[in-house]
C-alpha cells in the first residue's frame, strides 16, 4: 500500500521560517503534489504550493520556494514574516496524486519538543485520505 511521509522543520536561523518535506512511497508515477496548511486540501486547508512534474510549480504566500527533491519527494520553504506566518503547532498536509494508484494524503506538524533546527526523522505519517 502506498504511503506518504511528512517532515516539518523550523529553521534555526529564522525561528518563523519552516521547511516542509514530503515523500511518496509507492510504485506509481506522481502526477501532482499539493501542499496545504491548516488541514487537508479541500477540507479547510489553504493551498501553499502545487507541483506538476511536467508543467512546473505554482506557489502562494507565505511559500517561498517549492521544489522537487527526487521524483517522489518535494520540499517547501515558508517565509517567516507577516500575519500569515506559520506557528509551531501549524499542521501541514501533502497530497500526492499518483497514476494509476489515486490520491494519498498525510499531514504533519513540528514535533512538540523539537529545538530550532532539529526535527524528527521523516517517517510515514498517518494517511488521512486515499481517493
Amino acid at each position: 500500500t502506498p504511503e506518504v511521509w511528512v517532515q516539518v522543520r523550523m529553521e534555526a536561523t529564522e525561528l518563523s521560517s519552516f521547511t516542509i518535506r514530503c515523500g511518496f512511497l509507492g510504485s506509481g508515477s506522481i502526477s501532482l503534489v499539493t501542499v496545504s496548511w491548516g488541514g487537508p486540501n479541500g477540507a479547510g486547508g489553504t493551498t501553499l504550493a502545487v507541483l506538476h512534474p511536467e508543467r512546473g510549480i505554482r506557489q502562494w504566500a507565505p511559500a517561498r520556494q517549492a521544489r522537487w527533491e527526487t521524483q517522489s519527494s518535494i520540499s517547501l520553504i515558508l517565509e517567516g514574516s507577516g500575519a500569515s506566518s506559520p506557528c509551531a503547532n501549524t499542521t501541514f498536509c501533502c497530497k500526492f496524486a499518483s497514476f494509476p494508484e489515486g490520491s494519498w494524503e498525510a499531514c504533519g506538524s513540528l514535533p512538540p519538543s523539537s529545538d530550532p533546527g532539529l526535527s524528527a526523522p521523516p517517517t510515514p505519517a498517518p494517511i488521512l485520505r486515499a481517493d
Epitope: 502526477s31 511536467e54 508543467r55 505554482r58 494509476p100
Partner: antibody
Amino acid sequence: EVQLVESGGGLVQPGGSLRLSCAASGFTFRNYDMHWVRQAPGKGLEWVSDIGNSGETYYLGSVKGRFTISRENAKNSLYLQMNSLRAGDTAVYYCVREEFGYGMDVWGQGTTVTVSS
Amino acid sequence: DIQMTQSPSSLSASVGDRVTITCRASQGIRNDLGWYQQKPGKAPKRLIYAASSLQSGVPSRFSGSGSGTEFTLTISSLQPEDFATYYCLQHLNYPLTFGGGTKVEIK
C-alpha cells in the same frame, strides 16, 4: 456565479496590434492559472497561452515573441497583447480558467479578432 | 508536442443511440485529459475531467474511460441537446493540445 468576460476584439490590419482583456468574477482569481484558447472560423480549438498565479508564462510556438499574456490579480483581470498580427490569427479568443494541473473548467463567451486588409 | 488524434471526425446518429468517440495521444498522458462539448456560436463546456470523472451538473449519460494513450467518450443514450461538436484536451504538458473534434449530427 463564476464568470469570465472577454473584450477588446475587433478588425485589425496585418501587422497591427490588439489587446484583449478578460474580467473574472465569482472566484479567487489569484488561485488559478488562466489561459487563452482560440478557434479559427469553422476550425477546432487551439491553445494559445497560459499564465500561472505568480506570472509564469507559456506560449504556443507560433505566437511566441508576438503575443504577451499578463494578469493583474488585484483587478481580477487577464490580458493578451497581440502584436504583428497575421491573417492566421483570425479567430474567436476565449479566456479560460484552470485549477493548475486539473484542466480547464470555466470558459468565457469569447471575443472575435479579425485580421484583414 | 503531444498530438491528439480524435475519431471519427463526424458521425450521424439518432436520439437514443449509444455514441462512442475516441481520442489517441501520441505519447502517454496518464489520465490528464478532459472532454468538452461545443454548440454552434457557444463556448465549450467541460463534460469529463481526469479522463473519467464527470463534471458537476453534467448528465450521467456521459462517461469517459481510458488512460495512457487511448481515451473514449461515451454517450449512453443520445438526447436532442447532445448534437454538438466534442473535443478532447491533454493538459499533461505544454503546448496543451486539443483533438480535432467530432461533430455529432442528426441522422
